[in-house]
Interface confidence: medium
């Protein structure tokens, strides 16, 4: 025998109190798949969270963070205060990147500068707290008669907090 509840589409639930009729999810709740016996309560984006996508009968609300804060964790489970570029957030607050590291965003951690010599290249532009080192041609390419110049290596993306 087929379960009558399997006919209930997303956005409804199989109401045992009403002879297993498919009833629409009540306000502020949703079901994202068919055959559900209950609807889930919508997430509320409160406090430091702000609504990025409204809840519908078939999908949960999605939150991001109010100005001055950014998301951390899967599905923006937390918000933390922004730091400046060239800093990272520690337990003591925002701290400048140590020498040899950089962060070009208001979030995330300081990452080491690209080590140009590991790739046999010269440093074209020195790294700063806010930006990665840019590698130039290898010293061998700079010998007289050499004409080709290796394009700078793309700056490595600093670690992102998941959105």
């Amino acid at each position: 025998l087929q379960d009558p509840c399997s006919n209930c589409p997303a956005g409804t639930f199989c109401d045992n109190n009403r002879n297993q009729i498919c009833s629409p999810c009540p306000p502020n709740s949703f079901s994202s798949a068919g055959g559900q016996r209950t609807c889930d309560i919508c997430r509320q984006c409160k406090g430091v969270f702000r609504t990025r996508k409204e809840c519908s009968s078939t999908s949960n609300a999605e939150c991001d963070c109010t100005p001055g804060f950014h998301c951390l964790g899967a599905g923006c489970s937390m918000c933390e205060q922004d730091c400046k570029q060239g800093q990272e957030l520690t337990k003591q607050g925002c701290k400048d990147c140590r020498f040899g590291t950089f962060n070009d965003q208001k979030r995330g951690i300081c990452q080491p500068w690209t080590n140009c010599s590991l790739d046999g290249k010269s440093v074209l532009v020195n790294g700063t707290k806010e930006s990665d080192a840019v590698c130039g041609p290898s010293p061998a390419d700079l010998s007289p008669g050499a004409s080709s110049v290796t394009p700078p290596a793309p700056a490595r993306e600093p670690g992102h907090s998941p959105q």
Epitope: C45, V48, R50, P67, D82, K84, L89, G93
Partner: antibody
């Protein structure tokens, strides 16, 4: 307890700059942001800008060209500077703390009255 | 910029009454609205954030509600110390903006 205290010049000549210091106690600037808001009879409350715990700043676009906010964590002081003042900048200027729960102001200073006049 | 409209500049009430102050946002701000109380010659005092969360130490006769564009601050059993101006603020996006305020007066 949490306190914020603004200190400013009172009277500023037109075209001159305004500097206000906000001295805080009962909390650390390493952990909390500080907003600047002004209030005038004609325009009500206007948000001017904020300096966050890490020192990053966000300004109201209407004031960004002539506004600067900085701070000294060790002295528990936040510095506000606005250039090229005109008569309509006459207002009470407040500093206020941002809590860790939302982009709002949970504690306010008593405000400093600034008149722009020659 | 998001405009916060408090259409009533003044509201008359009596001690013990229940009164509702309204605020309308020019666009959807979710629940990212705060309410402040300001008495003459004083700085604003935080009452409510996130449309409905009372700040610490705020009496429970103050209740916030609403989402999207329409918000209400309700004061039940008004006390004489509640006679003040009430201002709403949105913090959904920069620049942060305030309503013009509603003054609560005695009938």
């Amino acid at each position: 307890q949490v306190q914020l205290q603004e200190s400013g010049p009172g009277l500023v000549q037109p075209t001159q700059s305004l500097s206000i210091t906000c001295t805080v106690s009962g909390f650390s600037l390493i952990s909390y942001g500080v907003h600047w808001v002004r209030q005038s009879p004609g325009k009500g409350l206007e948000w001017l800008g904020v300096i966050w715990s890490g020192g990053s700043t966000d300004y109201n676009a209407a004031f960004i060209s002539r506004l600067s906010i900085s701070k000294d964590n060790s002295k528990s002081q936040v510095f506000f500077k606005m250039n090229s003042l005109q008569a309509d900048d006459t207002a009470i200027y407040y500093c206020a703390r941002n809590p860790l729960t939302a982009t709002v102001m949970d504690y306010w200073g008593q405000g400093t009255s600034v008149t722009v006049s020659s | 910029d998001i405009v916060m409209t408090q259409s009533q500049k003044f509201m008359s009430t009596s001690v013990g009454d229940r009164v509702s102050v309204t605020c309308k946002a020019s666009q959807n701000v979710g629940t990212n609205v705060a309410w402040y109380q300001q008495k003459p010659g004083q700085s604003p005092k935080a009452l409510i954030y996130s449309a409905s969360y009372r700040d610490s130490g705020v009496p429970d006769r103050f209740t916030g509600s609403g989402s999207g564009t329409d918000f209400t601050l309700t004061i039940s059993n008004v006390q004489s110390e509640d006679l003040a101006e009430y201002l709403c603020q949105q913090y959904n996006s920069y620049p942060l903006t305030f309503g013009a305020g509603t003054k609560l007066e005695l009938k």
